[in-house]
């Protein structure tokens, strides 16, 4: 069966937007009218993993482009990077560890833990135009809180 | 240090069923990001990737295999299993595990290999 | 399947000789390479991780190089242990795949 993906749009628990910068880096800052068309979309797709009631294992994709989160270990460190990948493989049921995350529900706020990395989560800075990063820390200075906006295909 | 070391191999008839056992030392397969995998290798040919198995129960497997193999893993006595079933002329190899640590990867401890021939 | 060939199949070389080994991906696989090196009825053992990161205990006379879909392993000078074969694997996309091996032999 093929891999069940749904579009959406990712805020911050304190409503930054995520948007490209360069080709291969997503940073987060506040948008408003035109602008929020900036903002990135992504392709959520539901892959195989260990599953519950409020965790979930997916893969985020940007819409229509051929790059995908990932965790991988850079100078001993996990690191998040957008990876391209061959359009014609993927999405699929069966991702690579390093693409899967963990989608965590919890008080209406949604949590992104890597599959890889336990413990480290997609996460934004306090300050306005900075990089998305994979953080080790939940609670502290740095947001692991998003928000979820469904888009229509 | 870390050791693995392979057992189970042997002579089968077609159609029949091994299962291929590798025992570590030095390392847990509870530790987030630790992997093993099976590699096999025909005699007098390359290395093929067969199946792997991460700390957390994930399993991933080469598709040639067909769904005959299943890997398994019993943490507590720091083993990884291979059971192997419809067993073909073509499965005949030495099958090595080997561990690695997180995505993408690469295998930094090997065992030895067992021998597995299938053959009537 | 991401398909890897190695070249050469063969290489006959001298002790002291800088060697070259090329692997080949048939799609883009990033710095996701590694390479192997094994000796006839022994396991093999990883020389170089990340494209070219020297896996610890490794001489510094292997090196590797490359990135997207070619790849190349460099012994500056051949030592008489380095006759052996060396396999390349890609790790970017299931099922991981090695290239078929080279076989460095003494001239």
């Known amino acids: 069966a093929p891999v069940r993906s749904l579009n959406c749009t990712l805020r911050d628990s304190q409503q930054k937007s995520l948007v490209m910068s360069g080709p291969y880096e997503l940073k987060a800052l506040h948008l408003q009218g035109q602008d929020m068309e900036q903002q990135v979309v992504f392709s959520m797709s539901f892959v195989q993993g260990e599953e519950s009631n409020d965790k979930i294992p997916v893969a985020l994709g940007l819409k229509e482009k051929n790059l995908y989160l990932s965790c991988v270990l850079k100078d001993d460190k996990p690191t998040l990077q957008l990876e391209s990948v061959d359009p014609k493989n993927y999405p699929k049921k069966k991702m690579e560890k390093r693409f899967v995350f963990n989608k965590i529900e919890i008080n209406n706020k949604l949590e992104f833990e890597s599959a890889q990395f336990p413990n480290w989560y997609i996460s934004t800075s306090q300050a306005e135009n900075m990089p998305v990063f994979l953080g080790g820390t939940k609670g502290g200075q740095d947001i692991t809180d998003f928000t979820m906006q469904f888009v229509s295909s | 240090e870390v050791q693995l070391v392979e057992s189970g191999g042997g002579s089968v008839q077609p159609g029949g069923s091994l299962r291929l056992s590798c025992a570590f030392s030095g390392f847990s397969l509870s530790t987030s990001g630790m992997g093993v995998g099976w590699i096999r290798q025909a005699p007098g040919k390359g290395l093929e990737w067969v199946s792997h198995i991460w700390w957390d129960g994930d399993e991933s497997y080469n598709p040639s295999l067909k769904g005959r193999f299943t890997i398994s893993k019993d943490t507590s006595r720091n083993t990884v299993y291979l059971q192997m079933n419809s067993l073909r002329a073509e499965d005949t190899a030495s099958y090595f595990c080997a561990r690695n640590r997180y995505d993408p990867p690469w295998f930094v401890d090997w065992g030895q290999g067992t021998t597995v021939t299938v053959s009537s | 399947d991401i398909q890897m060939t190695q070249s050469p199949s063969t290489l006959s070389a001298s002790v002291g000789d800088r060697v070259t080994i090329t692997c080949r991906a048939s799609?883009?696989?990033?710095?996701?390479l590694s390479w192997y090196q094994q000796k006839p009825g022994k396991a093999p053992k990883l020389l170089i991780y990340?494209?070219?990161k020297l896996h610890s205990g490794v001489p510094s006379r292997f090196s590797g190089s490359g990135s997207g879909a070619e790849f190349t392993l460099t012994i500056s000078s051949l030592q008489p242990e380095d006759f052996a074969t060396y396999f390349c694997l890609q790790g970017k996309m299931l099922p991981w795949t090695f290239g078929q091996g080279t076989k460095l032999e003494i001239k």
């Open positions: 799609q883009d696989i990033s710095n996701y």
């Open positions: 990340y494209t070219s």
